[in-house]
Interface confidence: medium
């Protein structure tokens, strides 16, 4: 099998930050805050940011929010929603983060780095 194309610094940083969050939870992440689930498809970085930006006062995801800001090509503010949100489904931030992490890992396996 061919070797993987090295991921961009931002994506590598995002994956490693998501790993850090999922692996080092000592208490419910963001006090068990709920966020809108998203469709993990094109535009997911902006959609993920739109969900997570509505979580306030949770230092554990500040860095993730900052990295997603860099990966999303347009400005995102709290209360903003795109069609990528599954608006009838809310999940805990911890599950959201892990789902995003596993999806990114799958994309890397398949060679889709953007």
């Amino acid at each position: 099998s061919p070797g993987p194309v090295p991921p961009s610094t931002a994506l590598r940083e995002l994956i490693e930050e998501l790993v850090n969050i999922t692996q080092n939870q000592k208490a419910p992440l963001c006090n068990g805050s709920m966020v809108w689930s998203i469709n993990l498809t094109a535009g997911m970085y902006c959609a993920a940011l739109e969900s997570l930006i509505n979580v306030s006062g949770c230092s554990a995801i500040y860095r993730t929010q900052r990295i997603l800001h860099g990966l999303c090509p347009h400005k995102v503010s709290a209360g903003q929603f795109s069609s990528l949100h599954v608006r009838d489904t809310k999940i805990e931030v911890a599950q959201f983060v892990k789902d995003l992490l596993l999806h990114l890992k799958k994309l890397f396996r398949e060679g889709q780095f953007n």
Epitope: S1, T22, Q23, K98, K105, F108
Partner: antibody, heavy 122, light 108 residues
Framework: EVQLLESGGGLVQPGGSLRLSCAAS????????MSWVRQAPGKGLEWVSA????????YYADSVKGRFTISRDNSKNTLYLQMNSLRAEDTAVYYC???????????????WGQGTLVTVSS | SYVLTQPPSVSVAPGQTARITCGGN??????VHWYQQKPGQAPVLVVY???DRPSGIPERFSGSNSGNTATLTISRVEAGDEADYYC???????????FGGGTKLTVL
């Protein structure tokens, strides 16, 4: 096709040393972390050590730390395990395993060698 | 250090469903991989990333992970599924790979 071929096992006396090798082929060796996992006769799998693709980061089980050294030569597509101060409890089949992803903390092992037997006995 | 607990043995009749559990503190926050090992052979990855299957592994093998338990489910069990099964995670607090103690699946 991914292939991992271990060698270097054998009989060694307690306190002795042994160097295991794992020749890899069928993938871009330097892009993946590698690991050694052992299995004592009739027992379960026990992780021994791992190394990042570049070789810059190494990890060891507490039971072997300070006695075993993992290394790799990416120009030769080969993984090594230098085992010193061997004990009877190190007797096991030693497997070389390829990690499934570049980020070390997501490690699963998608390919394994057939193993090499290390017997520590006087 | 992080501990993964598996039942030593699980027995199931052919054609039935086998469920092998792997318990760990908040294991749902971790990424779990499962291996099958037959006597005298090297382990084989059968489920990775909690629930994904490598190519070549039958759809009968599936995984789930939440709370304090990860589960490997083998539906329509066949005699050839008889083997030892191990769960595995990465423990970031110790920078160690951790394996469960293994479960021997017996097909009656």
């Amino acid at each position: 096709e991914v292939q991992l071929l271990e060698s270097g096992g054998g009989l060694v006396q307690p306190g002795g040393s042994l160097r295991l090798s794992c020749a890899a082929s069928g993938f871009t060796f330097s892009s993946y972390a590698m690991s050694w996992v052992r299995q004592a006769p009739g027992k379960g799998l026990e992780w021994v050590s791992a190394i990042s693709g570049s070789g810059g980061s190494t990890y060891y089980a507490d039971s072997v730390k300070g006695r075993f050294t993992i290394s790799r030569d990416n120009s030769k597509n080969t993984l090594y395990l230098q085992m010193n101060s061997l004990r009877a409890e190190d007797t096991a089949v030693y497997y070389c395993a390829k990690a499934d992803f570049w980020s070390g903390t997501l490690w699963g092992f998608d390919y394994w060698g057939q193993g090499t037997l290390v017997t520590v006995s006087s | 250090s992080y501990v993964l607990t598996q039942p030593p043995s699980v027995s199931v009749a052919p054609g039935q469903t086998a469920r092998i559990t792997c318990g760990g503190n908040n294991i749902g926050n971790k990424i779990v991989h499962w291996y099958q090992q037959k006597p005298g052979q090297a382990p084989v990855l059968v489920v990775y990333d909690d629930s994904d299957r490598p190519s070549g592994i039958p759809e009968r093998f599936s995984g789930s992970n939440s709370g304090n338990t990860a589960t490997l489910t083998i539906s329509r069990v066949e005699a050839g599924d008889e083997a030892d099964y191990y769960c595995q995670v990465w423990d970031s607090s110790s920078d160690h790979v951790v394996f469960g103690g293994g479960t021997k699946l017996t097909v009656l």
